[in-house]
Amino acid sequence: IWSAVFLNSLFNQEVQIPLTESYCGPCPKNWICYKNNCYQFFNESKNWYESQASCMSQNASLLKVYSKEDQDLLKLVKSYHWMGLVHIPTNGSWQWEDGSILSPNLLTIIEMQKGDCALYASSFKGYIENCSIPNTYICMQRTV
Amino acid sequence: IWSAVFLNSLFNQEVQIPLTESYCGPCPKNWICYKNNCYQFFNESKNWYESQASCMSQNASLLKVYSKEDQDLLKLVKSYHWMGLVHIPTNGSWQWEDGSILSPNLLTIIEMQKGDCALYASSFKGYIENCSIPNTYICMQRTV
């Protein structure tokens, strides 16, 4: 209880925080915080490489989907946005920016197009797209 | 700086929080926090009154749209969900659960249907619907 009371004063809260309530983060200012991950949707269209650079400049990476449960807010995302998934032509696998391989049952990959990058679409779908095509993008920062 | 360092220890963070980063909330556990408001999307379909009751039972209200800027995450919401907007037949106005009147230029009201309740749809649209029709819903809690 003490820490909750302390946080109240720290954040200029006048009411005591119920124990079922908690703070989320820390995240960059004005980012979305959900289950202690930080997300931001960027409206300006960039190609995959520029999108990646933009996220990196904000100490983040392009969206990584690692858990349908922890990231269920992504079910309701409208439109299509670059995520950090790329195709490795040498072995045919899909991997994230951090080098980890896409696990089965996380995303449905939809190949309409020639390409080695993927756009995130609602309901955990990944649409293959040419990496040089401009699109909006999602940055993500995992809290420590 | 001190409060950031303190919060690090409080939240078992090993790194110092950059001053550009901040905590969001407090919110009920596993709710989305954005610009110090808390949101949750409920998947089960309920009529407007049941949706309202569900939000109230969680110390929240149905979604209230009060600022396109502070709530720009709503632009990207897929599908249709009950929000806390109701039609007052006596004076023809639309008002929120708290009794405040819907401000101009916040929502585009689309009358597809006879009804006195409204569904939130992406890009700040409100679809008029019969209040007894089951739909998913969005609860919101404004932090103090």
Epitope: S93, W94, L102, P104, L107, I109, M112, Q113, K114 | -
Partner: antibody, heavy 131, light 106 residues
Framework: EVQLVQSGAEVKKPGATVKISCKVS????????MHWVQQAPGKGLEWMGL????????IYAEKFQGRVTITADTSTDTAYMELSSLRSEDTAVYYC????????????????????????WGQGTTVTVSS | SYELTQPLSVSVALGQTARITCGGN??????VHWYQQKPGQAPVLVIY???NRPSGIPERFSGSNSGNTATLTISRAQAGDEADYYC?????????FGGGTKLTVL
């Protein structure tokens, strides 16, 4: 044999709504997306939108956005296309067509969908909009 | 939005080779699909993903795609090949059809 059988011709007044059905047989309904294509008299093909019967997800062409609703009923293996606020320019033949096939065991064990063109089409439904 | 340009009509002598083009900005980076449509009938897929033939489509039908032009080639043209032909691509989360080309076999 794979078949897509569409509902019969319709005559509608301007402002009305039409709903066309497309009943499939000969394959697993949820293994392919379903598309709808419009063809006005003497004109070319125009894609209207698609539905993934597995989860009901839709994508609509900008031209028809807001007026078209595409749905899929997995209990009857039937896809539907509803077009509202009809005008004379909507007088056309409407086709359903399957395309985008499901491969549960794609590379790396991933669930894949591939688009190999619209390989099976319905016979078409003529909609006439006239006052 | 993405535009596909096809010639309105192409004529070919019986037994000769017909080429129908489909122009689009950097179309070579996209998968192109071709459909044949005879009067009063539903379209039929004849080529998918640039150069692949569905089962039941004669070997006389072939496709290529590079740069800004995709091409449908019909060798040893027959009277039964007379039809409208449409190219199609996926762009910006929509399928786009070309305007169609009427093939006449003389």
């Amino acid at each position: 044999e794979v078949q897509l059988v569409q509902s019969g011709a319709e005559v509608k007044k301007p402002g009305a709504t039409v709903k066309i059905s497309c009943k499939v047989s000969g394959y697993t309904f949820t293994d392919y997306y379903m598309h709808w294509v419009q063809q006005a008299p003497g004109k070319g093909l125009e894609w209207m939108g698609l539905v993934d019967p597995e989860d009901g997800e839709t994508i609509y062409a900008e031209k028809f956005q807001g007026r078209v609703t595409i749905t899929a009923d997995t209990s009857t293996d039937t896809a539907y296309m509803e077009l509202s606020s009809l005008r004379s320019e909507d007088t056309a033949v409407y086709y359903c067509a399957r395309g985008i096939a499901r491969y549960p065991n794609g590379p790396g064990g991933l669930l894949y969908y591939y688009y190999y063109g619209m390989d099976v089409w319905g016979q078409g439904t003529t909609v006439t909009v006239s006052s | 939005s993405y535009e596909l340009t096809q010639p309105l009509s192409v004529s070919v002598a019986l037994g000769q080779t017909a080429r129908i083009t489909c122009g689009g900005n950097n179309i070579g980076s996209k998968n192109v699909h071709w459909y044949q449509q005879k009067p009063g009938q539903a379209p039929v897929l004849v080529i998918y993903r640039d150069s692949n033939r569905p089962s039941g489509i004669p070997e006389r039908f072939s496709g290529s795609n590079s740069g800004n032009t995709a091409t449908l080639t019909i060798s040893r043209a027959q009277a039964g090949d007379e039809a409208d032909y449409y190219c199609q691509v996926w762009d910006s989360f929509a399928f786009v059809f070309g305007g169609g080309t009427k093939l006449t076999v003389l």
